[in-house]
């Protein structure tokens, strides 16, 4: 069986809230991921949870990788096994998953100074929506390789996926709705696949006329013999996924093909605000791999509206302001902690702030509510003091950032926080200061003297 792994470990894990974190979509059946290690003389290749398949389609740099290796170090024309999967994926905390590979072979590598090679890959769920990043080598010593990979696949699956054609819940941080792409009245999209025609009807339960009541969302018809009709994915078996900047609709559970696999279809959506067909666009067949049929589809309905699309800056006439220098994205960065001199050490509250983004759930802020942009932590727990919902504004010579819709604070009200950012040239280090809190704990005000609040430039025009 060409798909059978030599070495493989479980590639998903459940967190304490029983939410599934699933790295299976990252597993490569052929080829491998190149790790960014800023050293042109060596290349480190990895697969996720299973070995690099060097027998099937071995790439030129991977040809020499020993069987079973999931981490292969290539130096010149030589390749070395520096790690094989041993233990399954581990959750080290809510936003971090760890995979460990060790070299099982007894013989030591001469460049490892007597140490046994090992690879640790830490998958980090980013604090905001972002495109995929390459796995990065963060430390290397005596053949111990530490890799960090910031990817949304490390986030819990409810954040990434939906069984419907929309992603718009609180969970998901985005607003996507593909339901307008559904065709009614028995019509369907047609995509030319050289020797086949594909009929598609997405986001609905409309029978495709050609498809013999197969409940197909994607139907494959042989051009030379139109009686040969196969379901290439059924509308009951649908997953919409938005991860690492990629929007994908998957239909599985189609008719079996000769290899024994069930046919499935993967539709890769791209945002195109000028798509034809009233913005709907049309699917284009791009190829088939192992009974999986791939399509790309340019449509305005794939233009993802993100909460993070809110501008992290402000304009005032021709003056531009940009607060993005203050944004904390992912570890090893840390949240800003506000200075609060008003309380004794015993009743001390810690105020954690991020700009234009949720606070990072690290350190004392680990228990903060997931979507809080400002969070207060004391001995009783944590509180959401406001979410990033509206863009910064220019007000009275300063930049005003208002975070709203925090935790309930009584009388049907929610906590709100104002941050006033005051221009202080050359200072990007100073922390915000708590100025006031009032209205029965419903309102907080911080002041922040920072270079990020200084005018950036005059806009052209």
């Amino acid at each position: 069986d060409i798909f059978k792994a030599n070495k493989e470990v479980p590639c998903y894990v459940f967190d304490e809230e029983l939410r599934k974190h699933d790295l299976n979509p990252l597993i490569k059946l052929s080829g491998a991921y190149l790790v960014d290690d800023s050293d042109p003389d060596t290349s480190l290749f990895i697969n996720v949870c299973r070995d690099i398949d060097t027998l099937r389609d071995p790439g030129s740099q991977l040809r020499a990788c020993p069987p079973g290796t999931a981490a292969c170090l290539v130096r010149g024309h030589q390749a070395f096994d520096v790690g094989q999967p041993r233990d399954g994926l581990k959750l080290v905390r809510k936003d971090r998953l760890v995979l460990s590979y060790v070299r099982e072979e007894a013989g030591k590598l001469d460049f490892c100074d007597g140490h046994s090679p090992a690879v640790t890959i830490t998958f980090v769920c980013p604090s905001e929506r972002r495109e995929g990043t390459i796995p990065k080598l963060t430390a290397k010593s005596n053949c111990r390789y530490e890799i960090e990979w910031i990817t949304e696949y490390a986030c819990h699956r409810d954040y990434l996926e939906s069984k419907t054609c929309s992603l718009s819940g609180e969970q998901q941080d985005v607003s996507i709705d593909l339901t307008p792409l559904a065709q009614s009245g028995g019509s369907s999209y047609i995509s030319d696949g050289k020797e086949y025609l594909f009929y598609l009807n997405v986001c609905g339960e409309t029978e495709i006329q050609f498809c013999n009541k197969k409940q197909a969302a994607v139907c494959q018809v042989k051009k030379s013999d139109t009686s040969q009709v196969k379901a290439a994915g059924r509308y009951h078996n649908q997953t919409l996924r938005y991860s690492d900047g990629d929007l994908t609709l998957i239909y599985f559970g189609g008719d079996e093909c000769s290899s024994g696999f069930q046919r499935m279809s993967v539709i890769n959506f791209e945002c195109n605000k000028t798509a034809g067909n009233d913005g709907k666009g049309t699917p284009v067949f791009t190829g088939e791999v192992d009974c999986t049929y791939f399509f790309t589809w340019d449509t305005e309905y794939a233009c993802v509206k993100e909460k993070e699309d809110l501008l992290c800056g402000a304009t005032d006439g021709k003056k531009r302001y940009d607060l993005s220098a203050l944004v904390r994205h992912a570890e090893p960065e840390q949240n800003w902690e506000a200075v609060d001199g008003s309380q004794t050490e015993t009743e001390k509250k810690h105020f954690f702030i991020n700009i234009c983004h949720r606070v990072l759930q690290e350190g004392k802020a680990r228990g903060c509510p997931e979507d809080a942009a400002v969070c207060a932590v004391d001995k009783n727990g944590s509180k959401n003091l406001g979410k990033f919902i509206s863009s910064p504004m220019k007000e009275k010579g300063n930049i005003q950032l208002s975070y709203s819709d925090g935790d309930d604070c009584g009388h049907g009200k929610k906590i709100k926080t104002n941050i006033t950012l005051v221009c202080k040239p050359g200072d990007l280090e100073s922390a915000p200061v708590l100025r006031t809190s009032g209205e029965g704990g419903c309102f907080y005000e911080f002041e922040w003297h920072t270079a990020a609040a200084c005018v950036l430039s005059k806009t052209e025009g």
Epitope: K28, S30, G31, A32, Y33, L34, D36, D57, G59, S60, Q61, L62, E131, G132, T133, I134, G245, D246, V266, N268, E270, T286, G287, E288, V289, T292, F294, T296
Partner: nanobody
Framework: QVQLQESGGGLVQPGGSLRLSCTAS????????IGWFRQAPGKGREGVSC????????YYHDSAKGRFSISRDNAKNTVYLQMNSLKPEDTAVYYC?????????????????????WGQGTQVTVSS
Amino acid sequence: QVQLQESGGGLVQPGGSLRLSCTASGFTWDSYVIGWFRQAPGKGREGVSCLDVDDGSIYYHDSAKGRFSISRDNAKNTVYLQMNSLKPEDTAVYYCAAVNRASMRFRRCLQVLRYDYWGQGTQVTVSS
């Protein structure tokens, strides 16, 4: 067996030209996207240009626009990167890479993450 072999690198003076070749074997040539990448000492690998062998679609990184040109010769299963007006900052090891076009989002074809197979690289040095 998928194999990628780069050639054509060397030492060239600023303002000079070089043509790199990436010859592929072991796979259905027109089912792949071929990308050119480079890696300078101490830096990460970055995308330069890419080409969909099937339909001829092309993409360039901003740093390559107007100076570099990617092309293909289907009879020879080869993709070329013609580099003109070379600058010292173009000094790097240049790699070609391949990925099956079926699953590739072509607009992301300058992303290292997307590629499955890599060549060994060829050194380009721009110096007077």
